[in-house]
Interface confidence: low
């Protein structure tokens, strides 16, 4: 028998520095977690103790903090090289700055293979990108070889900016011939490493003949056997065992997100490359693991540029950006409108001639808007200003909801109106009218939404049975501020870009902004 240790990360999302337990900015260092310096300590410890170790990443290193905003992927290549990753799969967020934003900082600089079997380049891009990412890679490990085959969510064109010269194929269809090819090369130990979410990971384990292990990402799935060490609730045991269609037991793993855990899976293979046993658990990278001093020093050196960036002007406002709780928790506020407009703008993807865009709607809890911005400071808007407006370090995500769920959400928005509570919704691509003289649960008297399948966008009444795409904060997607109906009834959830980054990019693009209060939210009675 031959034993392999797979160390894995996924959905790190720019958390190069240690973070708080909830993966936001580290405040109290003695209770902080993760970060590349701490990760390196643990990886090195395992490399010294065990003979056959692979360090793999399942995508979405890009996007999530000011590190990515400033360094645009160069930081990912630099620190992944320093940690000596063995392979990485492309995630959807690796395309956030377009194909060029992937090629130059990451693909050309990485000293490890970057993989995806279901992304096919065409046209002029095919020769430009040739060899910079691969469908698979055969890695020598000790006296053996291991095949790693990559995959990426086929939804990427809806979630990011891969352009028109990359085709995202069905994962299973694309993986099978690559695995077959590896078999003909006498590679009998094959890991599928990819970024399509836990449900697809399980399907790959079930359907792709010859895959021995699946290491996934995208869904931020936390798996754990036994008593979990922090606040994440396991979606199942680690590893999650899938019985393949040809009767094999295939371990499937994922390691939550944000570099909080290091996935640790030990696999025992027989001489024919069959998995005899698999066991392990994610390792919580808490403060009991010291940060490696050399990596930490490097982080501090790279940090200097971030501090300078946060005080630079992104753009100007010529109006007061009213982010006060007195406004945003009671009525339409222009800060809410600005943020929602930025959220929609960030999700412009012209992927189908029938649609002007795939999504037109935004909702945003008023309680998530934590500060106004005064235009009297020369109109200057900085990252620092935006960090006061959006301090919680969330993401703006894409969900699919039925009209009936949206209706419930808007009823919840005003079910206890007047108490300055955070659930009052700010909107984009939505016109809502409330009648507060009616009983809670029956206060939405008009709810019109902006069409997407139209050449001239206009507002139509919400249809209860129709499925709509909506951009919203991850806080709401996870049921925050009492929006349990969203969490319970959403049909799809894809994590998006860092909230501050979305707004800062929009302001930089617009240069001068002047959001107005324009009748998105109305009250049919009272003096609101």
């Amino acid at each position: 028998a031959w034993e392999l240790t797979i160390l894995h990360t996924n959905d790190v999302h720019s958390r190069l520095e240690q973070t708080s337990e909830d993966s936001s900015k580290c405040v109290n260092a003695s209770r902080c977690m993760g970060g590349v310096a701490r990760l390196f300590t643990k990886v090195q410890q395992i490399r010294r103790a065990e003979p056959n170790v692979l360090l793999l990443d399942a995508g979405d290193q890009y996007q999530g903090t000011i590190w990515f905003t400033v360094y645009k992927g160069a930081e990912v290549a630099h620190f992944m090289n320093a940690l000596r990753y063995d392979a990485m799969a492309l995630g959807n967020h690796e395309f956030d700055n377009g194909v060029e934003g992937l090629i130059e900082p990451l693909l050309k600089e990485a000293k490890f293979p970057i993989l995806s079997a279901n992304i096919k380049a065409k046209g002029p891009l095919a020769s430009q990108i040739s060899g910079l990412y691969l469908p698979y890679k055969v890695l020598p490990v000790g006296d053996e070889v291991v095949g790693i085959v990559g995959y990426t969510s086929k939804e990427t064109p809806f979630l990011s900016n891969p352009g028109t010269n990359l085709v995202f194929e069905d994962e299973i269809t694309a993986l099978q011939p690559e695995v077959d090819k590896l078999k003909t090369l006498n590679v009998n130990k094959i890991i599928a490493l990819g970024h399509s979410g836990f449900e697809m990971d399980k399907l790959i384990a079930q359907k792709v003949r010859g895959v021995d292990v699946v290491v996934g990402g995208h869904s931020n799935t936390f798996l754990y056997t036994g008593n979990p060490p922090s606040k994440e609730v396991p979606a199942g045991k680690y590893p999650f065992i899938v019985t393949s269609d040809d009767g094999r037991k295939v371990p499937v793993v994922q390691a939550y997100a944000f570099g909080k855990y290091l996935g640790y899976l030990k696999i025992e293979f027989d001489e024919r490359g069959n998995v005899i046993s698999s066991h392990g658990n994610p390792i919580l990278l808490n403060s009991s693991i010291p940060e490696d001093p050399s990596i930490k020093a490097d982080i501090n050196k790279w940090r200097i540029k971030l501090d300078n960036y946060s005080t630079q002007e992104l753009g100007k406002t010529i109006v007061y950006l009213d982010g006060s709780s007195q406004s945003c928790r009671f009525r339409e506020c222009n800060m809410g409108n600005l943020i929602c407009d930025a959220m929609i703008n960030n999700n412009l993807r012209h992927t189908d001639e029938m649609f002007w865009n795939h999504v037109s709607m935004c909702i945003l809890n008023g309680g998530g808007i934590r500060s106004p911005i005064d235009e009297r400071n020369n109109g200057t808007i900085t990252w620092e200003n935006l960090a006061a407006v959006l301090p919680f370090g969330g993401t703006f995500d894409l969900v699919q909801l039925k009209g009936s769920t949206l209706k419930k959400a808007f009823e919840h928005s005003v079910h206890r109106y007047g108490q300055s509570t955070g659930e009052f919704l700010q909107v984009g691509g939505i016109h809502v009218v409330y009648d507060l003289s009616r009983k809670p649960g029956d206060r939405v008297v008009k709810l019109d939404v902006l069409c997407t399948k139209c050449r001239v966008p206009s507002y139509d009444p919400l249809k209860m049975d129709e499925v709509y795409k909506v951009i919203l904060p991850n806080f709401l997607a996870n049921g925050g501020d009492g929006f349990q109906m969203i969490k319970d009834e959403l049909l799809r959830h894809d994590s998006g870009d860092q909230d501050i980054n979305v707004v800062s990019t929009y302001i930089s693009k617009m240069k001068v902004i002047y959001p107005a209060v324009e009748g998105r939210i109305k009250f049919s009675t009272g003096s609101h």
Epitope: D22, S24, V27, N28, K231, V233, S325, R370, S371, A387, A388, P391, F392, R416, Q419, T421, G479, G482, Q484
Partner: antibody, heavy 119, light 106 residues
Framework: QVTLRESGPALVKPTQTLTLTCTFS??????????VGWIRQPPGKALEWLAH???????YYNPSLKSRLTISKDTSKNQVVLTMTNMDPVDTATYYC???????????WGQGTLVTVSS | EIVMTQSPATLSVSPGERATLSCRAS??????VAWYQQKPGQAPRVLIY???YRYSGIPARFSGSGSGTEFTLTISSLQSEDFAVYFC????????FGQGTKLEIK
């Protein structure tokens, strides 16, 4: 590490105004996301939340006591002040200040200060 | 006001045994519930937040469950230092606490 300490009079007369100060260390109320609240507990009874204040001056009060309460902060001194007007013997309680987490639960508490209302 | 009702008012259990404390909310508070332990002369300390998440440093014998209106705090194997008063608190609306359950040695 995070510490909070309450200070104020041990005895107040009925109808008087109570002023309590919470002095804290280990965090700053100018940091985005921080909040400090006040909770009281009459002898042998349950806890009752009174008020809290966020770093951005956002203030919340218990609706049943709102007319009597004022909360404020002095960021430079790391202090939060609660005033309660028109004190009554039923307001006799131990008054705690606590750091409010993102949602309204309290991870760090002061040791409490007993306030007796009596003539 | 959301009223939190705890039961029983007093619970007598032997060391090493399991203790189950209940808390009922007067309306749906989803999972926005915390549990605190308080010993005589001391401030409360948080054990559980968001109904089921153990706070940092809290022993694994403490666990929370429930959502909506019914919540439970379970102490799997009582240690001598666990005998105290336990309060639940909702934070779906402005915070309100239960009246407490006194856990005493049988």
């Amino acid at each position: 590490q995070v510490t909070l300490r309450e200070s104020g009079p041990a005895l107040v007369k009925p109808t008087q105004t109570l002023t309590l100060t919470c002095t804290f260390s280990g965090f700053s109320l100018s940091t985005s996301g921080m909040g400090v609240g006040w909770i009281r507990q009459p002898p042998g009874k349950a806890l009752e939340w009174l008020a809290h204040i966020w770093w951005d001056e956002d203030k919340y009060y218990n609706p049943s006591l709102k007319s009597r309460l004022t909360i404020s902060k002095d960021t430079s001194k790391n202090q939060v002040v609660l005033t309660m007007t028109n004190m009554d013997p039923v307001d006799t309680a131990t008054y705690y200040c606590a750091r409010r987490e993102r949602w309204a639960w309290f991870a760090y508490w002061g040791q409490g200060t007993l306030v007796t209302v009596s003539s | 006001e959301i009223v939190m009702t705890q039961s029983p008012a007093t619970l007598s259990v032997s060391p090493g045994e399991r203790a189950t404390l209940s808390c009922r909310a007067s309306q749906n508070v989803f999972t926005n519930v915390a549990w605190y332990q308080q010993k005589p002369g001391q401030a409360p300390r948080v054990l559980i937040y968001s109904a089921s998440y153990r706070y940092s440093g809290i022993p694994a014998r403490f666990s929370g469950s429930g959502s909506g209106t019914e919540f439970t705090l379970t102490i799997s194997s009582l240690q001598s230092e666990d005998f105290a008063v336990y309060f639940c608190q909702q934070y779906n609306s402005y915070p309100t606490f239960g009246q407490g359950t006194k856990l005493e040695i049988k």
